[in-house]
């Protein structure tokens, strides 16, 4: 959960239930403002951030993003629909969170910050969307051996790999701020 | 052209009601969260209630909860305020106003309508 | 409940710089409330300068400028106009609904 939640920063009226906006806003900034402290770690480490052969370690990801048909768009907005596709996207997030843990020194605790406060991100917004079943969780054998197989690859395709996630993963949570703020 | 037209104010009685409404045009009304503001007579403005683009969620001002309800139809892009019980520190002018989607969107209110409750 | 507080009024001289603030009767104001700054001046209808804290609306002189200092939210105008002289509404998105701060009325002296 992220900093400035306790009790002498918010007015006793006014706690938030976990599902509104505000709280759904700063948990989603939080978990941004972790991410960038990662992307630092990584862009200062190696060279990936400038790299032109993103394409060759994409093949091997299959990373959520948001389309048109979600409906997270300004154009063909659909909250329902695109409720479920953020729920979705960050379940399927999780295994590549998990994949970052060990791929940091110095900022080890912000890789399991990142990891917890998505966690709890997703239970705040299954919350909200308590009347959709439309929510698929990932099949853990898969995730599993997909682990595997991304911990298998070569130092290089270790270090665009994570470059990738962290890219994809700030991607897809800034289109999910702006969708928020239409439901 | 964006244009926010309000209708639906007059004069009621204390615990009368009254239905406002909203017709948008010149923009993808269904994409936005849309809302009610008011400012009574020679104060500041006061925000009424919200509602989500799909109208899934709904959202109240604590003056209000209870005796207002929001909604919409997103095949007329209108939005709708009923109004029960009402009360006379309910007189106010009521604006409605879309939300903001991208960096430099312009933002557009109506000319508002005048409800007054008194007896 | 907690209040969305202004100053009641400010004056500022032709081509000077101002600030107005909006902070929170309990609690710092953050990026997650999104603060919007309105303009209104007498018989008109409110219009918005700034929301989601810096993005200025369409329109916007570039005078106007938002921020959010310490643990409140900021209007800064730089170089007043006499046009700039009307009444400046906060407001701020709190737990699922959004308050107005009570207004602050600007003077351009002069």
């Known amino acids: 959960v992220p900093p400035g939640e306790d009790s002498k920063d918010v007015a006793a009226p006014h706690r938030q239930p976990l599902t509104s906006s505000e709280r759904i806003d700063k948990q989603i900034r939080y978990i941004l403002d972790g991410i960038s402290a990662l992307r630092k770690e990584t862009c200062n480490k190696s060279n990936m951030c400038e790299s032109s052969k993103e394409a060759l370690a994409e093949n091997n990801l299959n990373l959520p993003k948001m389309a048109e048909k979600d409906g997270c768009f300004q154009s063909g907005f659909n909250e329902e629909t695109c409720l479920v596709k953020i729920i979705t996207g960050l379940l399927e997030f999780e295994v590549y969170l998990e994949y970052l843990q060990n791929r940091f020194e110095s900022s080890e605790e912000q890789a399991r910050a990142v990891q917890m406060s998505t966690k709890v991100l997703i239970q705040f917004l299954q919350k909200k969307a308590k009347n959709l079943d439309a929510i698929t969780t990932p099949d853990p054998t898969t995730n599993a051996s997909l682990l595997t197989k991304l911990q298998a690859q070569n130092q290089w395709l270790q270090d665009m790999t994570t470059h990738l996630i962290l890219r994809s993963f700030k991607e897809f949570l800034q289109s999910s701020l702006r969708a928020l703020r239409q439901m | 052209q964006v244009q926010l037209v309000e209708s639906g104010g007059g004069l009621v009685q204390p615990g009368g009601s009254l239905r406002l409404s909203c017709a948008a045009s010149?923009?993808?009304?269904?994409?936005?969260?849309m809302y009610w503001v008011r400012q009574p007579p020679g104060k500041g403005l006061e925000w009424v209630s919200a509602i989500s683009a799909g109208g899934g969620s709904t959202y109240y001002g604590d003056s209000v909860k209870g005796r207002f309800t929001i909604s919409r139809d997103n095949a007329k892009n209108t939005v709708y305020l009923q109004m029960n019980s009402l009360k006379p520190e309910d007189t106010a002018l009521y604006y409605c106003?879309?939300?903001?989607?991208?960096?430099?969107?312009?933002?557009?209110w109506g000319q508002g309508t005048q409800v007054t409750v008194s007896s | 409940q907690t209040v969305v507080t202004q100053e009641p009024s400010l004056s500022v001289s032709p081509g000077g710089t101002v600030t107005l603030t909006c902070g929170l009767s309990?609690?710092?104001?953050?990026?997650?409330?999104?603060p919007g700054w309105f303009q209104q001046t007498p018989g008109q209808a409110p219009r918005a300068l700034i929301y989601s804290t810096n993005d200025r609306h369409s329109g916007v002189p570039s005078r106007f400028s938002g921020s959010i200092s310490g643990n409140k939210a900021a209007l800064t105008i730089t170089g007043a106009q006499p046009e700039d002289e009307a009444d400046y509404y906060c407001a701020l998105d709190i737990g699922d609904i959004t308050e107005f701060g009570g207004g602050t009325h600007l003077t351009v002296l002069g």
């Open positions: 010149g923009f993808t009304f269904s994409s936005y969260r």
């Open positions: 309990s609690g710092s104001v953050t990026a997650s409330n999104y």
């Open positions: 106003k879309k939300s903001t989607w991208a960096d430099g969107e312009s933002d557009y």
